[in-house]
């Protein structure tokens, strides 16, 4: 029997290698049964996750899943870091795993490195 708990499908230790100046959509896949929960994004600052207010977000509906999307228009160097989405469901908070954005500033890179290079070359990244 399928669980009717809200589930947030962000993989643990997942990451995205992206470039400053590009648009980017960070998706939080949400599974729910009856009523869509309220979902928010936050950005980790040490062990605290700071709620992102006033940012462009949207919902996308697919067959078995909804996606709560945080829009970066465009990506800024300061967007580098780890993000988490959370759902408010029956007065409980369900938190996703965090996902990390590795932002490369194209001005400081002579050519665009591969995403594997970016994830393994912290000197290219903003903290």
């Amino acid at each position: 029997k399928e669980s009717c708990d809200v589930q947030l499908y962000i993989k643990r230790q997942s990451y995205h290698s992206i470039f400053a100046g590009d648009p980017f959509k960070l998706e939080c896949p949400v599974k729910y049964c009856a009523h869509r929960p309220q979902v928010t994004w936050c950005k980790l600052n040490g062990t605290t996750c700071v709620k992102l207010e006033g940012r462009h977000t949207s919902w996308k509906q697919e067959k078995n899943l909804s996606f709560f999307i945080l829009h970066f228009e465009p990506v800024l160097p300061s967007d580098n870091g780890s993000y988490r989405c959370s759902a408010n469901f029956l007065s409980a908070i369900i938190e996703s795993h965090s996902t990390t954005l590795y932002v490369t500033d194209v001005k400081s890179a002579s050519e665009r490195p591969s995403k594997d290079e970016m994830a393994s070359r912290p000197w290219l990244l903003y903290s």
């Epitope: 962000i10 993989k11 643990r12 230790q13 997942s14 938190e95 965090s98």
Partner: antibody, heavy 119, light 112 residues
Framework: EVQLVESGGGLVQPGRSLRLSCTTS????????IHWFRQAPGKGLEWVGR????????KYTASFKGRATISADGSKSIAYLQMNSLKTEDTAVYYC????????????WGQGTLVTVSS | DVVMTQSPLSLPVTLGQPASISCRSS???????????LNWLQQRPGQSPRRLIY???KRDSGVPDRFSGSGSGTDFTLKISRVEAEDVGVYYC?????????FGQGTKLEIK
């Protein structure tokens, strides 16, 4: 029924390359991380690296970086381990394993494939 | 890299008796999400490994309840309450909190 079946092992000469395949079934590979491990004869287990079939992102143990490439074809539910510049000390049984990425709900291992590096 | 140290490396046990394996990590395995990613694998002779325990103490489906895991931080234990003949093999702890993921040396359980 869940299955992970490795193939592509065998005898290979030092300095050559080899591509191992891991054919999966019974679950959605995109919900998992695909790991490759190896075990030299009579020795313990060693993590080679992992791939996220949903987006192609990979992580490796430092000693394999640049010599190993892990990839996956989500549409075919197959993962690969490409090993270059093989040495005799790469002789081992190579295992793929699939670990659910969201809630740790499962961790399946294949039966392994033996790679022997010898001239 | 996180060093995982298991003891004992060899464990002769009488059938029906309990067994205990220790695993210590060189740094805490507590992740920033508040969970501890410490796993135990069983490898029977001539077979591939299988996951027994994950998140320190959660048993995989199909794993008998005579197996239990405990611990926190850097100190972990796998216990078998009553050893059976099918438990013979090598047991490994491994951590997937920190990259690169690392294993203990393995503990060989045999029947006395």
């Amino acid at each position: 029924e869940v299955q992970l079946v490795e193939s592509g092992g065998g005898l290979v000469q030092p300095g050559r390359s080899l591509r191992l395949s891991c054919t999966t079934s019974g679950f959605n590979i995109k919900d998992t991380y695909i790991h490759w491990f190896r075990q030299a004869p009579g020795k313990g287990l060693e993590w080679v690296g992992r791939n996220d079939p949903a987006n192609g992102n990979t992580k490796y143990t430092a000693s394999f970086k640049g010599r190993a490439t892990i990839s996956a074809d989500g549409s075919k539910s197959i993962a690969y381990l490409q090993m270059n510049s093989l040495k005799t000390e790469d002789t081992a049984v190579y295992y793929c394993a699939s670990y659910e990425g969201y809630y740790e709900r499962f961790g399946y291992w294949g039966q392994g494939t033996l790679v022997t590096v010898s001239s | 890299d996180v060093v995982m140290t298991q003891s004992p490396l060899s464990l002769p046990v009488t059938l029906g008796q309990p067994a205990s394996i220790s695993c210590r990590s060189s740094q805490s395995l507590l992740d920033r999400d508040g969970k501890t990613y410490l796993n135990w694998l069983q490898q029977r002779p001539g077979q591939s490994p299988r996951r027994l325990i994950y998140l320190v103490s959660k048993r995989d489906s199909g794993v008998p309840d005579r197996f239990s895991g405990s611990g926190s931080g850097t100190d972990f234990t796998l216990k078998i309450s009553r050893v059976e003949a099918e438990d013979v093999g090598v047991y490994y702890c491994w951590q997937d909190t920190h990259f690169p993921y690392t294993f203990g040396q393995g503990t060989k359980l045999e029947i006395k």
